[in-house]
Interface confidence: low
């Protein structure tokens, strides 16, 4: 005597997050009469997804017609993918009765979701760092599967070694997330430098994913101070210049102390960028010697970005 | 600054192959940009991405190009080639070389080289 | 493939007018877009980058907006040397694929 068999022809069928899956089912005969049911997972914990019989199931579709008599065609088309529509779907034969009697299932068909990882964000240190410093970047991608990605680490297209990748949930999820954790020493040059990060994954058809940041926001440049003195004028005016270069970032407050007291003081802004993208800035003094009897110690202070002042000093000789 | 310039034949006959060639001057292709682009113009139309190449040699190409295209690189010539095989009066275009910088786009561009599929 | 729809395909305008072109992207595409300026029988040359960065060398009259599906590349103040055609290119998927082209033409 010929058995009913339900046949589900494909061991696994793989989707791309967002496209629909198609789960193919035959039954072998049309008899007994009674309802196909479509279920993920096994055991009493299992999930309808479809039935032939009662329930609204908008996202599912049969492939045939259902109504059709003589069908045996038990497909059925799942719209607009998800990473949680993953698991192992079984199409079962109920005979009919009251209630209905399980009779046959199929194989199972595993659904896979190929969901593609999110967006790269790349964050970098929370304070700047001076050149010869370490700091670390932090790149994180969500919601891809399968697990497998590659991440890499680049800074200005070189690629970078020094960086620790993640890749959660260790054990099978419906999607997975990675963070990586790169390690950049910064150089004086690197005001206009940027890291990326790059996230290679099979949804991705070759075209990775790019995360950047600009290393200007995880850098300070601390300026090179120098004071130099012109010749005196016939005003008996001496010009005392304070000279404040390759510094980075703009935000800097220069004082002119004569003889400890404060003499003026100004904040730098709408300065030209150097090439490396650091800044330079020049500020004058003019001392009026005839008013002085001794020498006078003129001291350019500078607090660059929050940090402690930088003083440099020099002293203008008052003839006797 | 990095120049380009393109170099090869500006007539190709039907079913051949169509080979052509970028110079990079003033830089070298393995550092800075990571990808080398070919694009192409035909006639009064618009512009069209044929592929790129890292200076790797990894490569990736329009799937609309993908059977007919190879794109290598010559890193000691500091060189990168287009080869477009079965070519027919469609490829008649102008054809041009280019840098893709990380970040900000295609910066620098060959002045172009016209291409001519004619028997 | 990615679609970008650039309109309109040609524009007429007078110097000193402001001229505004836009570029739709089938898909989302974030900021990944680039902005060229190609004038007849030269190279096209880069404008905007990602979308609203300005080129080096480029004049602080061009400039470009959105993020997304819908870009706008603007010329605040059109000069007789700005006639040429201008494409926008999205770089967010392989293949990169322009737009058709705006050809801009002085009145």
């Known amino acids: 005597e010929e058995e009913l068999q339900v046949i589900q022809p494909e061991k696994s069928v793989s989707v791309a997050a967002g496209e629909s899956a198609t789960l193919n089912c035959t039954a072998t005969s049309l008899i007994p009469v009674g309802p196909i049911q479509w279920f993920r997972g096994v055991g009493p914990g299992r999930e309808l997804i479809y039935s032939q019989k009662e329930g609204h199931f908008p996202r599912v579709t049969p492939v045939s017609d259902p109504t059709k008599r003589n069908n045996m065609d038990f497909s059925i088309r799942i719209s607009n993918i998800t990473p949680a529509d993953a698991g192992t779907y079984y199409c079962v034969k109920f005979r009919k009765g009251s209630p209905d009697v399980e009779l046959k299932s199929g194989a199972g068909t595993e659904l896979s979701v190929r969901a593609k990882p999110s967006a790269p964000v790349v964050s970098g240190p929370a304070v700047r760092a001076t050149a010869e410093h370490t700091v670390s970047f932090t790149c994180e991608s969500h919601g891809f599967s399968p697990r497998d990605i590659t991440l890499k680490w680049f800074k200005n297209g070189n690629e970078l070694s020094d960086f620790q990748t993640n890749v959660d949930p260790a054990g099978k999820s419906v999607s997975y997330s990675i963070r990586s954790t790169a390690r950049v020493v910064l150089t004086r040059r690197d005001v206009h430098s940027q890291v990326i990060c790059e996230v290679a994954h099979v949804t991705l058809q070759g075209d990775p994913l790019r995360g950047t940041a600009n290393l200007s926001e995880a850098i300070r440049v601390p300026p090179f101070l120098e004071v130099t003195q012109q010749s005196m004028r016939a005003d008996n005016q001496v010009n005392v210049t304070c000279q404040v270069t390759k510094f980075y970032p703009q935000r800097l407050q220069l004082t002119w102390l004569e003889n400890g007291n404060v003499s003026r003081t100004e904040m730098a802004s709408a300065l030209p960028e150097n090439k490396d993208g650091t800044y330079n800035w020049t500020s004058w003094l003019l001392v009026n010697v005839s008013a002085h009897r001794d020498d006078v110690k003129l001291t350019c202070q500078v607090e660059h970005d929050g940090q402690p002042a930088v003083n440099k000093s020099f002293s203008v000789k008052v003839s006797a | 600054q990095v120049q380009l310039q393109e170099s090869g034949p500006g007539l190709v006959k039907p079913s051949q192959t169509l080979s052509l060639t970028c110079t990079v001057s003033g830089g070298s292709i393995s550092s800075g940009s990571p990808y080398w682009s070919w694009i192409r113009q035909h006639p009064g139309k618009g512009l069209e991405w044929i592929g790129y190449?890292?200076?790797?040699?990894?490569?990736y190409y329009n799937p609309s190009l993908k059977s007919r295209v190879t794109i290598s690189v010559d890193t000691s010539k500091n060189q990168f080639s287009l080869k477009l095989s079965s070519v027919t009066a469609a490829d008649t275009a102008v054809y041009y070389c280019a840098r893709e910088g990380y970040h900000s786009g295609m910066d620098v561009w060959g002045q172009g080289t016209t291409v001519t599929v004619s028997s | 493939d990615i679609q970008m729809t650039q309109s309109p395909s040609s524009l007429s305008a007078s110097v000193g007018d402001r001229v505004t072109i836009t570029c739709q992207a089938s898909q989302d595409i974030s900021n990944y877009l680039n902005w060229y300026q190609q004038k007849p029988g030269k190279a096209p040359k880069l404008l905007i980058y990602?979308?609203?960065n300005l080129a080096t060398g480029v004049p602080s009259r061009f400039s470009g907006s959105g993020s997304g599906t819908d870009f706008t590349f603007t010329i605040s103040s059109l000069q007789p040397e700005d006639i040429a055609t201008y494409y926008c290119q999205q770089f967010a998927y392989l293949p990169w694929t322009f737009g058709g082209g705006t050809k801009v033409e002085i009145k």
């Open positions: 990602d979308a609203s």
């Open positions: 190449i890292y200076a790797s040699g990894f490569t």
